[in-house]
Interface confidence: low
């Protein structure tokens, strides 16, 4: 049968906690022995671990309230897939019975003495009551027993005297409006109310007492908002040190709105909490050097050879660059001033060529002039000779890459009457005017 499966079993209460879901078998639920299950909602919770006895329940109340009785307690075999000690199946209850005694003896009733004399009338004018009493000692009760009935009785009595009427206050009148609309100002706000000694007035014959207390009262007004306190600036703090070691910097002074702090909706201090000043170190800042762009590669040559052009003979070439702009002990340029590489010279070499595909369209030229056009080209591209791409120039220094250098003379079949470049031009459409963006903002 399907069961409700839970993720926890609470040992102290025997309850299932953390519902995982219903409609699963006991076997599937108990794949995790930390889980627990119920056969129906609110039913007995059984843990999935191997069966063992629960803790003993508390002792039930004693079967009688006085003299000797007995009381029960139980424990249950809880768990799954096994038995508790004594070969007992899960769900089985085991009982213990012990003697108990809440009170050694049982209560016994007592008996009343005779009524005592009537006490004086409870009032000195008009009508009241008088009382008489009796004692529960004839005989006295035992073991917490009592006597049946009342220990005193009362009856009406009449003094035959007219009572004076004492004054009593009528209800308080309304509170007057507060003397101020907020508290914490120069005058503490108060409200006042009064009342009359007329509910009733004191009688003249026989004379009644006047009303006790005062005919008016005052109190501090509650619930009023505190009076607003406007904020005030404290003094300017010290000027901060100049934060730079060269050129111009900015120092700052600060002040705090705490003289006093604004309170209860009072306005914050007007003006700025900080002010700044320029500070001048009178020291020029260092300027780091920056490399110019590389110069042109020198011609590709080989020492002791007049020309290596159009031959499978590797040579060397170099290019240089200049470190510019270093001043005031700035950093020198990092890296090499000269670059050397190995090369094959194809300067002015007649090479077989082939026409390239069309290039992408270029930019519109002139960008701000009349009738700008864009162009694309097909170029007669030389087919480079299949010389070795790396060479070993010096024993033990490994292979070096070799680059082709120079402008060859490619030979292509004529295309549209051209031998080197075929160009196609088109006008650019819907051309916007060139305007200085700075001027546009103004």
């Amino acid at each position: 049968d399907p069961v409700l499966c839970f993720t926890q079993y609470e040992e102290s209460s025997g309850k299932c906690k953390g519902l995982l879901g219903g409609g699963v078998s006991v076997e599937d639920c108990c794949l995790n022995t930390a889980f627990a299950y119920q056969k129906r909602s609110g039913g007995l919770c059984q843990p999935c671990r191997s069966p063992r006895w629960s803790l003993w329940s508390t002792w039930a109340p004693c079967s009688v309230t006085c003299s000797e009785g007995s009381q029960l307690r139980y424990r249950r075999c809880v768990g799954w897939n096994g038995q508790c000690s004594g070969k007992v199946a899960p769900g089985t209850l085991e009982w213990q019975l012990q003697a108990c005694e809440d009170q050694q003896c049982c209560p016994e009733m007592g008996g009343w003495s005779g009524w005592g004399p009537w006490e004086p009338c409870s009032v000195t004018c008009s009508k009241g009551t008088r009382t008489r009493r009796r004692a529960c000692n004839h005989p006295a009760p035992k073991c917490g027993g009592h006597c049946p009935g009342q220990a005193q009785e009362s009856e009406a009595c009449d003094t035959q005297q007219v009572c004076p009427t004492h004054g009593a206050w009528a209800t308080w009148g309304p509170w007057t409006p507060c003397s101020a609309s907020c508290h914490g100002g120069p005058h503490e706000p108060k409200e006042t109310r009064s009342r009359k000694c007329s509910a009733p007035e004191p009688s003249q014959k026989p004379p009644g007492k006047p009303c006790p207390g005062l005919a008016y009262e005052q109190r501090r007004c509650t619930g009023l908002p505190p009076c607003p306190v406007a904020g005030g600036w404290g003094p300017w703090g010290p000027v901060s040190p100049c934060p730079v070691t060269c050129g111009l910097g900015q120092t700052m002074e600060q002040r705090t709105c705490n003289h006093p702090v604004p309170q209860h909706g009072g306005p914050f201090c007007a003006g700025d909490a900080t002010r700044t000043h320029i500070c001048n170190t009178a020291v020029p800042c260092p300027v780091d050097g920056e490399w110019d762009s590389w110069g042109e590669w020198s011609p590709c040559i080989r020492r002791n050879m007049k020309s290596i052009s159009c031959q499978e003979i590797p040579g060397q070439q170099s290019r240089g660059r200049t470190c510019r702009g270093r001043k005031f002990d700035g950093h020198r340029c990092a890296g090499q001033q000269q670059d050397i590489r190995h090369c094959y010279s194809i300067q002015h070499c007649p090479l077989k060529g082939s026409w390239s595909e069309w290039s992408t369209w270029g930019l519109c030229m002139p960008p701000c002039g009349p009738n700008p056009t864009r162009a694309r080209q097909r170029l007669c591209t030389p087919l480079l000779p299949k010389y070795p791409p790396t060479v070993s120039m010096v024993e033990g220094q490994g292979e070096k890459n070799v680059t082709f250098w120079g402008r060859p003379l490619p030979r292509c079949e004529e295309l549209q009457g051209q031998k080197l470049v075929v160009e196609e031009k088109r006008p650019c459409l819907h051309v916007p005017a060139c305007k200085d963006p700075e001027e546009e903002e103004l």
């Epitope: 519902l19 879901g21 609110g42």
Partner: nanobody, 129 residues
Framework: QVHLVESGGGLVQAGGSLRLSCAAS????????MGWFRQPPGKERQFVAA????????YYADSIKGRFTISRDNAKNTVYLQMNSLKPEDTAVYYC??????????????????????WGQGTQVTVSG
């Protein structure tokens, strides 16, 4: 066993209000946690609101906070959903659900439809633009 019947649905203009009721049969209504869920047309069922057996803890979906209020009257065996400032996206079939409180461990469970054993047949709420 608890039997749940929803009522109070209908057609209302955007910005209007409706009050849904869910009447439960059974003497132990006060020991059940109650939830409202909704299923918009063509979408999955969504959690709306839930209330514990005593009403001491209440949970709402973010999409309806401040507009819908869940409450219960254990003497009348009824849970209510007061819906104000209704929007066209509130259009859905609204379902009432119940589960014995002992089965729960925290707010996460109240927001999962699978946590509830008993469901009503639903009431249609349509909000026109």
């Amino acid at each position: 066993q608890v039997h749940l019947v929803e009522s109070g649905g209908g057609l209302v203009q955007a910005g209007g209000s409706l009050r849904l009721s869910c009447a439960a049969s059974g003497r132990t209504f006060s020991s059940y946690a109650m939830g409202w869920f909704r299923q918009p047309p063509g979408k999955e069922r969504q959690f709306v609101a839930a209330i514990t057996w005593s009403g001491s803890s209440i949970y709402y979906a973010d999409s309806i906070k401040g507009r819908f209020t869940i409450s219960r009257d254990n003497a009348k065996n009824t849970v209510y959903l007061q819906m104000n400032s209704l929007k066209p996206e509130d259009t859905a079939v609204y379902y009432c659900a119940a589960e014995e409180t002992s089965a729960y461990s925290g707010s996460y469970y109240y927001m999962m439809g699978d946590s509830y054993s008993y469901w009503g047949q639903g009431t249609q709420v349509t909000v026109s633009g």
